[in-house]
């Protein structure tokens, strides 16, 4: 039975050209995390494997940095980075848990005025 829950940084906004940290945390389960996949829409951004460590997809290696922890740092943000991001926790024996973050990348002047998502 899957008892765990994933907490995320929620719905966030960031400034064009800046950086953002995507964070997920799996709680309420004793299952072993074997791998965490980070996806943007249907594209794989990065993998953190418990045994093999981090792998960043070649097409994102210039703008994606591993960490902190099991999180992911996106750099040199563009408006095209707006969208959904998923953290997919592969665990044993529970199975797969998925968390979702929606990122809006704002023009600098908008971001400076504190536009933020409302967390549901």
């Amino acid at each position: 039975m899957m008892t765990g829950t994933i907490e995320t940084t929620g719905n966030i906004s960031a400034e064009k050209g800046g950086s953002i940290i995507l964070q997920c945390h799996l709680s309420s389960t004793t299952a072993q995390v074997t791998q965490v996949n980070w996806e943007q829409q249907d594209q794989l951004l990065a993998i953190c494997n418990a045994d093999l460590g981090w792998h960043i997809s070649p097409s994102f290696k210039d703008r994606v940095a591993p960490g902190p922890g099991l999180g992911l740092t996106l750099q040199s943000l563009t408006v095209n980075d707006t969208g959904e991001y998923f953290c997919i926790y592969h665990t044993y024996p529970d199975g797969t848990y998925t968390g979702r973050i929606f990122l809006e990348v704002l023009e600098s002047s908008v971001a400076e005025h504190g536009a933020r998502f409302q967390i549901p």
């Epitope: 719905n11 969208g83 959904e84 998923f86 979702r100 929606f102 809006e104 998502f117």
Partner: nanobody, 125 residues
């Protein structure tokens, strides 16, 4: 409880257009992120398009980009999918889905709370 009813499906020749509608019951339609999904015979359900509750954010699957347009009319509690340049591979049952609340669009089926019964689109010459 939200009820979703799709309409507008049918048989159409390749290259032609169709517009699907999804009528929603419920008082808070304007707060629902919504999406269109489809399932072809013998295949898994896949996302087609999705839109945030305020219409600011839109998602399209790569296979329909530039051909399909999702839109909504909050005054009519209706979601639309305009499908142009239809292809045989677009043949499927199309489902409308809604989520109670949330920010941005939701491209994956697991996040939706309510589903319609579907409308069949057949693209054939």
């Amino acid at each position: 409880q939200v009820q979703l009813v799709e309409s507008g499906g049918g048989v159409v020749q390749p290259g032609r257009s169709l517009r699907l509608s999804c009528a929603a019951s419920g008082p808070s339609f304007s707060s629902y992120p919504m999406g269109w999904f489809r399932q072809a015979p013998g295949k898994e359900r896949e996302s087609v398009a999705a839109q945030s509750s305020d219409g600011r954010f839109t998602y399209y699957a790569d296979s329909v980009k530039g051909r399909f347009t999702i839109s909504r009319d909050n005054s009519k509690n209706t979601l639309y999918l305009q499908m142009n340049s239809l292809r045989a591979e677009d043949t499927a049952v199309y489902y409308c889905a809604a989520r109670d609340s949330g920010s941005g669009y939701y491209s994956r089926a697991q996040w939706y709370d309510y589903w319609g019964q579907g409308t069949l689109v057949t693209v054939s010459s």
